[in-house]
C-alpha cells in the first residue's frame, strides 16, 4: 500500500504520528502553549492522501494560529470593560454592576492559554426571582429575562463557538436551576488537569457521600469512607481503543482506570467495577454481574489483560455499542435482583467514557445513554443515581457537543471534559479522589423523608443543660464541637454541672455529653452599653463547647455544614479556589431568604432573614421597644451587622429556651448554618409549660415581633481562631 | 394539530395474527423526539402498554414482557404510519386497541399526549 | 411487576372539590400523569410531570406527587367533568397505568 507523503510541517510546532507514514495513520499536531494547531490532525488514507477531517478544502499549510477566549455578548445590569471581539490569551475583562444589583462571581476575569476563562461568570443579581439570576457566559446569547418557579431559559453560543452544558434551564421548586452552566468554547479549546481533578473530584465525592451519608473512621486506614448501609455503586469504565488511539495511548488509558479503581476501592465503599473496551464492537473484560467486580485485585488484574490486539479486526468507534453494552449489563442486573427490590434500586451508577474521538458508527450514543436514563428511572427527581462523565482525550477529533450531549447535566458539576493528552488524563486521575482531602464527617445531611424523627432531619441540633432544667440549644458543627450562644452562660461559670444532649439512634432521649471546655466570645457583655440606656446588648453573643468526648457519627448525631469551609465547600458543590465570599453570596442570595431553626419540641419552624435594604426596614423595629430601649437613637447600637433579622410577616419566632439554636438554609439536599438565635422582642412560649404550644403575636403588637440571629459571615475571625485545626477554612 | 386515524379489522379469529395500523398527521413517524406506541384497554385487564418504535438515527423497538414473543411494531416512513402485529391471538386480547404518541422517559416525558380514537377489536370464531 | 391503585369509583358534588389518589412504590421518585377518558372516547392527557397542565385543560385540574402517592384534584368540579380518570407512570422497561377511578358528578 502507497505511504503518505512527509511534508507535512507545521511552522512553530511538533506532530506524531499513530502508525507511522502508513493508511490508517493519524497525524497530530501540536503547538507551545497559547497557540492552537490548525487543523488539528490529518489522516492517512488508503489511496496514499493526507485527509484534514472537517475540512472542505485541498490541504492547506499548517500552522501554529494564537488562542483566544470569547468576548461577552451580552452583559445585564452592569458594564465590563476593555470591550473587544475577543481575548488574547493574559488579557483580562472587569465587570461592575449598576447601582442596586451585586456582582456575584468573578469581578475580574483572565483569558487562559487553553482558550478558558479562569473564575466563575459573573452575574449582576438583585435577588428578586425565585432563581437567582442564572447569569450568561461568555460567548453565550440567553433567551428568557423571568426567574420565577417554571421558568424556562436557553442559551446558544455565538458564531463558530460550542456550547457545553446545559441549552435550556428550568427555575426549579427549591430555587435552584436544572441541568448544568453552559460555557461556549472555542472548538480547539480543551481542559487543564488541575481544573478537571477537582471538578471531577467534587462531582464523584458528592456522588460518594450520596452513596454514603453515614460514614465512620477507621483509624488504622487514615480518612476512608466505610458504608454503614445499603448504599452500592457500580462504576463502568469504558476505554476507546479504536485506530485513532495510539497502542501507548492505551497503555495510559488503562493505567488512569487502574488508578481511578485503586482510589474508588480505598473509599471502602460498596462497589462493583465493570471494565468495557470498544472500537467497533465492545468487549465486556468485567461485568458488574461477576462477583470479582467488588474485588479490587480480580478488576486491576482484568484491566491489566486488557489487550490492545483484541479489536485489531475493527477499528471503528462505536460508542452507542459500547455503552448499549452497560445498558444490557444493567437489564440483566435487574432481571437478577428484581425490578421493584430496593437491592436494585438504591445502586448508584457511575460511567466514565474514555475517548478519543467522536462516534462515526453504530447507533447515536445519546440513545444508548437515553435506554440507560429509562431503565434507572432517572429524571430531575432521581438524578443521583446516575452520573456519566465524557472525557476526551486528545483535541485532535474529539467532540464536544457529542460529550456534552453524553456527560450529566447537574447544577454546580461539570461531566464533559477534553484533556490535551493521555499524560494530561493520568494527572487527573492521580489527583481527583484524594482520600486526605476528605474529611471523616460529611456534614449537613438530614434526613427528609416524611417518616424521619425530628432529631434525623436535623442530627446537628443539641440541648445545652443544667443539671435542672432546659437552657439553650446549640449545633454540632464536628464530632467534638458545638456552636451556640455565650449568653447561655452569664450565670455562673462552673460547666461541670452542664450537659449537652445529642441526638443518639438508640435513646429516643440522646445521649448526654459533658463539657471540656467553654469558649466563651470575650466580646460578649450584656450590660456593655448600660450607660446609653441599652439595657441589654447581644453584640458577640457566640461561644464553643468542646465536648469530652467525640460523638460517634449516626442517623441522630452529624454536623451541619459551617460556610467558609472546605467541607461545605464541598456540600455546595463549589469549584477549588471558592472564598468565603462567595459562600455568603451563594447562601444569602436574597432580599428575603428563607432559613430555618429548631423548636423546643424538635420541629423546624421557617423563618425569612431580611437582607440589604430588606434588613435596615426589618430591624429598624427595635426603636418602638421603649422598656428595653428607653432612650435609643441609633437602632445600630443594639442591632450591629453582626445580627441577621427576621420575623416579619408569617415567620415564626424562636421562644427563650431555642437561644444558641442553628438557623440554617437547605441548598442542593443538604444543610448549612448561616446564624445562631441570639434575642428577640417577643417570646411565642411566654406563660406556657407545653413544649408544643406557642402563641403567635397579636397583630396589634407594638412592637412587633422581631428576632436577631449571629450572622456567622461576620463572626469568621473568632471562629477561624478557635476551629482552625478541627475545620478547613476558605480564604476570607 | 398532530391526529392519529387508526384502520383496521374489528373482528380476528383465535390464533390469527391481529394487525393494525395508525396513520399519522401533523407530525412524523421518524420525528427525533417522539416514541409512537400502542396500547390496550379492556374491562378484565384496563390500560396495557404493548410497545413502542422511535427513530433516532436508527429505528428502535420496545415491547412489554407479557407480549414480546409474539408483538411486532412496523414504521412506515413513506405513508407516515406505525402499524401492529400481534400473532397468534386468544379471547384474551379482545381489547380496545389505541396508538399514541408519547415521548422518552429519559428526556423527562413518560406521557402520551396524542391518542388514536381506538378500534375495538374482538377475538372470536 | 410494578402497580399503580385508584379508587374504584368516587362522588362528588357539582361545585365540589374532587381528590383522586394514585398509590405506588416511591411514585414519588417518578412522574405521574393523568389522563380522562369519557365514555366512547380515547384517553386526553389532563396532568403531565406530576402537576404540570396540558393547554386547553381548564385551571381546575391540579396534581400533586410525592412519597408513594400522586393526587389529581379537581377543585370546583363540573358536570362534564364525569369520566374515568387514569394514572399512568414510566417504570425502568414499562410504562404502567393506574387501576382507574370512575368519578360521578352527584
Known amino acids: 500500500a502507497p505511504s503518505c507523503p512527509q511534508n507535512v510541517n507545521i511552522s512553530g510546532g511538533t506532530f506524531t504520528l499513530s502508525h507511522g507514514w502508513a493508511p490508517g495513520s493519524l497525524l497530530t499536531y501540536s503547538c507551545p502553549q497559547g497557540l492552537y494547531p490548525s487543523p488539528a490532525s490529518r489522516l492517512c488514507k488508503s489511496s496514499g492522501q493526507w485527509q484534514t477531517p472537517g475540512a472542505t478544502r485541498s490541504l492547506s499549510k499548517a500552522v501554529c494560529k494564537p488562542v483566544r477566549c470569547p468576548a461577552p455578548v451580552s452583559f445585564e445590569n452592569g458594564i465590563y470593560t476593555p470591550r473587544l471581539g475577543s481575548y488574547p490569551v493574559g488579557g483580562n475583562v472587569s465587570f461592575e454592576c449598576e447601582d442596586g444589583f451585586i456582582l456575584r462571581g468573578s469581578p475580574v476575569r483572565q483569558c487562559r492559554p487553553n482558550g478558558m476563562w479562569d473564575g466563575e461568570t459573573a452575574v449582576c443579581d438583585n435577588g428578586a426571582g425565585h432563581c437567582p439570576n442564572p447569569g450568561i457566559s461568555l460567548g453565550a446569547v440567553r433567551t428568557g429575562f423571568r426567574f420565577g418557579h417554571g421558568d424556562k431559559v436557553r442559551y446558544r453560543c455565538s458564531s463558530n463557538l460550542v456550547l457545553t452544558g446545559s441549552s435550556e434551564r428550568e427555575c426549579q421548586g427549591n430555587g435552584v436551576w436544572s441541568g448544568t452552566e453552559p460555557i461556549c468554547r472555542q472548538p480547539y479549546s480543551y481542559d487543564f488537569p488541575e481544573d478537571v481533578a477537582p471538578a471531577l473530584g467534587t462531582s464523584f465525592s458528592h456522588m460518594l457521600g450520596a452513596t454514603n451519608p453515614t460514614q465512620k473512621t477507621k483509624e488504622s486506614l487514615g480518612r476512608k469512607i466505610q458504608i454503614q448501609r445499603s448504599g452500592h455503586l457500580n462504576l463502568y469504565l469504558l476505554l476507546d481503543c479504536s485506530q485513532s488511539v495510539s497502542e501507548n495511548d492505551f497503555l495510559i488509558f488503562k493505567e488512569s482506570a487502574s488508578l481511578m479503581v485503586d482510589r474508588i476501592f480505598s473509599f471502602e465503599i460498596n462497589v462493583s467495577v465493570a471494565i468495557i473496551t470498544f472500537a467497533s464492537e465492545p468487549k465486556v473484560l468485567m461485568s458488574v454481574l461477576n462477583d470479582n467486580s467488588r474485588d479490587m485485585t480480580e478488576v486491576i488484574s482484568s484491566l491489566e489483560n486488557a489487550n490492545y490486539k483484541d479489536h485489531e479486526n475493527g477499528t471503528g468507534t462505536n460508542t452507542y455499542a459500547a455503552l448499549n453494552s452497560v445498558y444490557l449489563m444493567m437489564n440483566n442486573q435487574m432481571r437478577l435482583l428484581g425490578m421493584e427490590t430496593m437491592a436494585w434500586q438504591e445502586i448508584r451508577h457511575a460511567i466514565i467514557l474514555l475517548t478519543d474521538g467522536k462516534s462515526n458508527m453504530g447507533g447515536s450514543p445519546k440513545t444508548a445513554v437515553d435506554h440507560i436514563r429509562e431503565i434507572l428511572n432517572i429524571n430531575q427527581k432521581r438524578n443521583d443515581y446516575l452520573d456519566i462523565y465524557a472525557i476526551g482525550v486528545g483535541k485532535l477529533d474529539v467532540d464536544w457537543r457529542e460529550l456534552n450531549e453524553l456527560g450529566s447535566k447537574k447544577d454546580g458539576e461539570r461531566h464533559a471534559f477534553i484533556l490535551q493528552d493521555t499524560k494530561a488524563l493520568h494527572q487527573v486521575f492521580e489527583h481527583m479522589l484524594d482520600v486526605s482531602k476528605l474529611t471523616d464527617t460529611i456534614c449537613g445531611v438530614g434526613n427528609m423523608s416524611a417518616n424521619a424523627s425530628d432529631q434525623e432531619r436535623t442530627p446537628w441540633h443539641v440541648t445545652i443543660k443544667p443539671k435542672s432544667q432546659e437552657t439553650c440549644r446549640g449545633a454540632l458543627i464536628s464530632d467534638q464541637w458545638v456552636l451556640t450562644a455565650a449568653h447561655c452562660f452569664r450565670d455562673g461559670n462552673d460547666h461541670s454541672l452542664w450537659r449537652v444532649n445529642v441526638g443518639d439512634p438508640k435513646s429516643q432521649w440522646g445521649k448526654e455529653f459533658l463539657i471540656e471546655k467553654a469558649v466563651i466570645s470575650p466580646g460578649f457583655d450584656v450590660f456593655a452599653k448600660k450607660n446609653q440606656g441599652i439595657l441589654e446588648f447581644y453584640g458577640d453573643d457566640i461561644a464553643l463547647l468542646k465536648l469530652a468526648q467525640k460523638v460517634k457519627m449516626s442517623t441522630h448525631a452529624r454536623p451541619i455544614c459551617l460556610p467558609c469551609t472546605m467541607e461545605a465547600n464541598l456540600a455546595l458543590r463549589r469549584p477549588q479556589g471558592s472564598t468565603c465570599r462567595d459562600h455568603e453570596n451563594e447562601l444569602l442570595n436574597k432580599q428575603s431568604v428563607p432559613a430555618h431553626f429548631v423548636a423546643l419540641n424538635g420541629s423546624k419552624l421557617n423563618i425569612n432573614l431580611k437582607m440589604g435594604v430588606e434588613w435596615t426596614s426589618c430591624a429598624e423595629v427595635v426603636s418602638q421597644e421603649k422598656t428595653m430601649f428607653p432612650n435609643l437613637t441609633d437602632v445600630r447600637e443594639v442591632v450591629t451587622d453582626q445580627f441577621l433579622c427576621s420575623g416579619t410577616q408569617e415567620d415564626e419566632s424562636p421562644c427563650k429556651g431555642e437561644s444558641g439554636g442553628a438557623v440554617f438554609l437547605e441548598r442542593r439536599f443538604r444543610f448549612f448554618q448561616v446564624g445562631l438565635v441570639s434575642w428577640g422582642l417577643y417570646n411565642p412560649c411566654l406563660g406556657s409549660a407545653d413544649k408544643n404550644s406557642r402563641k403567635r403575636a397579636p397583630r396589634s403588637k407594638v412592637p412587633p415581633p422581631r428576632d436577631f440571629h449571629i450572622n456567622l459571615f461576620r463572626m469568621q475571625p473568632w471562629l477561624r481562631q478557635h476551629l482552625g485545626d478541627v475545620l478547613n477554612f476558605l480564604p476570607l | 394539530q398532530v391526529q392519529l386515524q387508526q384502520s383496521g379489522p374489528g373482528l380476528v379469529k383465535p390464533s390469527q395474527p391481529l394487525s393494525l395500523t395508525c396513520a399519522i398527521s401533523?407530525?412524523?413517524?421518524?420525528?427525533?423526539?417522539?416514541?409512537w406506541s400502542w396500547i390496550r384497554q379492556s374491562p378484565s385487564r384496563g390500560l396495557e402498554w404493548l410497545g413502542r418504535t422511535y427513530y433516532r438515527s436508527k429505528w428502535y423497538h420496545d415491547y412489554a414482557v407479557f407480549v414480546k414473543s409474539r408483538m411486532t411494531i412496523n414504521p412506515d416512513t413513506s405513508k407516515n404510519q406505525f402499524s401492529l402485529q400481534l400473532n397468534s391471538v386468544t379471547p384474551e386480547d379482545t381489547a380496545v386497541y389505541y396508538c399514541?404518541?408519547?415521548?422518552?422517559?429519559?428526556?423527562?416525558?413518560?406521557?402520551?399526549?396524542?391518542w388514536g380514537q381506538g378500534i375495538l377489536v374482538t377475538v372470536s370464531s | 411487576s410494578y402497580e399503580l391503585t385508584q379508587p374504584p369509583s368516587l362522588s362528588v358534588s357539582p361545585g365540589q372539590t374532587a381528590s383522586i389518589t394514585c398509590s405506588g412504590h416511591k411514585l414519588g421518585d417518578k412522574y405521574a400523569c393523568w389522563y380522562q377518558q369519557k365514555p366512547g372516547q380515547s384517553p386526553v392527557l389532563v396532568i403531565y410531570?406530576?402537576?404540570k397542565r396540558p393547554s386547553g385543560i381548564p385551571e381546575r385540574f391540579s396534581g400533586s406527587n410525592s412519597g408513594n402517592t400522586a393526587t389529581l384534584t379537581i377543585s370546583g368540579t363540573q358536570a362534564l367533568d364525569e369520566a374515568d380518570y387514569y394514572c399512568?407512570?414510566?417504570?425502568?422497561?414499562?410504562?404502567?397505568f393506574g387501576t382507574g377511578t370512575k368519578v360521578t358528578v352527584l
Open positions: 399514541a404518541r408519547g415521548g422518552m422517559p429519559a428526556s423527562d416525558i413518560p406521557h402520551f399526549d396524542n
Open positions: 401533523g407530525d412524523s413517524v421518524s420525528s427525533n423526539s417522539a416514541t
Open positions: 410531570q406530576d402537576n
Open positions: 399512568q407512570a414510566w417504570d425502568s422497561i414499562t410504562y404502567v
